[in-house]
């Protein structure tokens, strides 16, 4: 028996369902009574789900997994993982045994989009050209860790005087806070981009300083 899985990682959004695809080619006359199917975590060998002795043995993994019982006889051994969590990320191995056995591993990459950044300025009043200001760009509840970029109003990257911190919450999602310190000109626009490297999802925030009052322009 030959087991086939997708070579590319399966990308799943947090709180959605994911399908880890696995298939085999059944011989003519194959019946489910001959099938032993085991899904397990590749690294720890922890059992996730199994089908043995002609029946589904159920989920051994937080009761969030399921097979596709009607499709098993056609060689579809895929696993459905419900309400994906950050902690589900990793490699899963699909073992299929009929007369002989084969196995293959599939990777699950978990992702969550970052929120539109909120921009804050300190100090935020009585600003004058030559003043040093701190612009903070905050974006929340994303996964994995973000890439953060700053650009000035002409699209040139700002790399000096940038400090970025990322903290995971209890669900493993990251809150990003990036701080840019700049000396003000007569006016200026400063933009922050928070990029999710897995989803290639960009979230932009901008602040334009034109004396008083400050403006926070809409996204372009």
């Amino acid at each position: 028996v030959e087991v086939q899985v997708s070579e590319d990682p399966v990308v799943a959004l947090v709180d959605t369902d994911a399908t880890l695809r696995c298939s085999f080619s059944p011989e003519p006359g194959f019946s489910l009574a001959q099938l032993n199917l085991i899904w397990q975590l590749t690294d720890t060998k922890q059992l996730v789900h199994s089908f043995t002795e002609g029946r589904d043995q159920g989920s051994a993994y937080s009761n969030r997994t399921a097979l596709f019982p009607d499709l098993l006889v056609q060689g579809n051994a895929s696993l459905r993982l419900q309400r994906v969590r950050v902690t589900d990320e990793g490699s899963y191995t699909c073992f299929v045994s009929i007369q002989d056995f084969d196995s293959a591993a599939v990777s699950l990459q978990v992702a969550a989009p970052y929120s539109k950044p909120s921009m804050t300025l300190e100090p935020n009043k009585d600003l004058r050209p030559g003043n040093m200001v701190t612009i903070t760009c905050s974006s929340y509840q994303g996964y994995p860790e973000a890439e953060v970029f700053w650009k000035d109003g002409q699209g040139v990257p700002l790399t000096g005087n940038v400090t970025t911190s990322q903290m995971a919450n209890e669900r493993g999602l990251f809150d990003v806070h990036s701080v840019l310190r700049v000396v003000l000109g007569a006016n200026g626009t400063y933009s922050c981009l928070v990029r999710n490297p897995v989803l290639q999802q960009d979230a932009h925030g901008s602040v334009t300083i034109t004396g008083q009052p400050l403006t926070f322009p809409p996204e372009a």
Partner: antibody
Framework: EVQLQQSGPELVRPGESVKISCKGS????????IHWVKQSHAKSLEWIGV????????YYNQKFKGRATMTVDKSSSTAYMELARLTSEDSAIYYC??????????????WGAGTTVTVSS | DIVMTQSPSSLAVSAGEKVTMSCKSS????????????LAWYQQKPGQSPKLLIY???TRESGVPDRFTGSGSGTDFTLTITSVQAEDLAVYYC????????FGGGTKLEIK
């Protein structure tokens, strides 16, 4: 008419430096960044870096960092790029180009005619 | 770094014919928020500087004839010239601006 006028061809010796100029006209010079691009037979078009004419902020391609220096003179609407410690591999045409766009997507809508730099002993 | 690969490196067609050239990027250039691809096409005629033809993968720069069409998304892009004219003799470059800027190696268009 929007134009970027570049300085003339340069013949320099290995190890020396060259400074190329790019003068903007027909638009408000400090409203747009100036990018520099190298064109050689070996490497096609290569982005060197960018300078924001209003913010005086520069960003260099890692390959050219430490050897290229971009500056602007706002009073004359001119951008400059100096390239130091030249070798034969720096023989190329160097273009300045105006950065145009919005948000985080920028493209080069106006180009200078190019400055040919030849490095030879 | 994002690598841009253009093909073919050169091609020759007769005036009036349709031509297509390809540009592939090593990672997606699609901004999922704006649904725009950060890809531009430039035309460089012999002895001249490059000229912007297309940006956002498919938006024609003002003044560019409508026989030039950009298409594609993600990692695969195409520039099509529906009815090639003698003045289209040039090298065509694609360029990504998703992460800094990199150009493809160019496609040289020759007229038979």
């Amino acid at each position: 008419e929007v134009q970027l006028q570049q300085s003339g061809p340069e013949l320099v010796r290995p190890g020396e430096s060259v400074k190329i100029s790019c003068k903007g006209s027909g638009y408000t010079f400090t409203d747009y960044a100036i990018h520099w691009v190298k064109q050689s037979h070996a490497k096609s078009l290569e982005w060197i870096g960018v300078i924001s004419t209003y913010y005086d902020n520069t960003y260099y391609n890692q390959k050219f960092k430490g050897r290229a220096t971009m500056t602007v003179d706002k009073s004359s609407s001119t951008a400059y790029m100096e390239l130091a410690r030249l070798t034969s591999e720096d023989s190329a045409i160097y273009y300045c180009a105006r950065g145009y766009g919005s948000s985080f997507n920028w493209y080069f809508d106006v180009w200078g005619a190019g400055t040919t730099v030849t490095v030879s002993s | 770094d994002i690598v841009m690969t253009q093909s073919p490196s050169s091609l020759a067609v007769s005036a009036g014919e349709k031509v297509t050239m390809s540009c592939k990027s090593s990672q997606s250039l699609l901004n999922s928020r704006t649904r725009k691809n950060y890809l531009a096409w430039y035309q460089q005629k012999p002895g001249q500087s490059p000229k912007l033809l297309i940006y956002w993968a498919s938006t024609r720069e003002s003044g560019v004839p409508d026989r030039f069409t950009g298409s594609g998304s993600g990692t695969d892009f195409t520039l099509t010239i529906t009815s090639v004219q003698a003045e289209d003799l040039a090298v065509y470059y694609c360029k990504q601006s998703y992460n800094l800027y990199t150009f493809g190696g160019g496609t040289k268009l020759e007229i038979k």
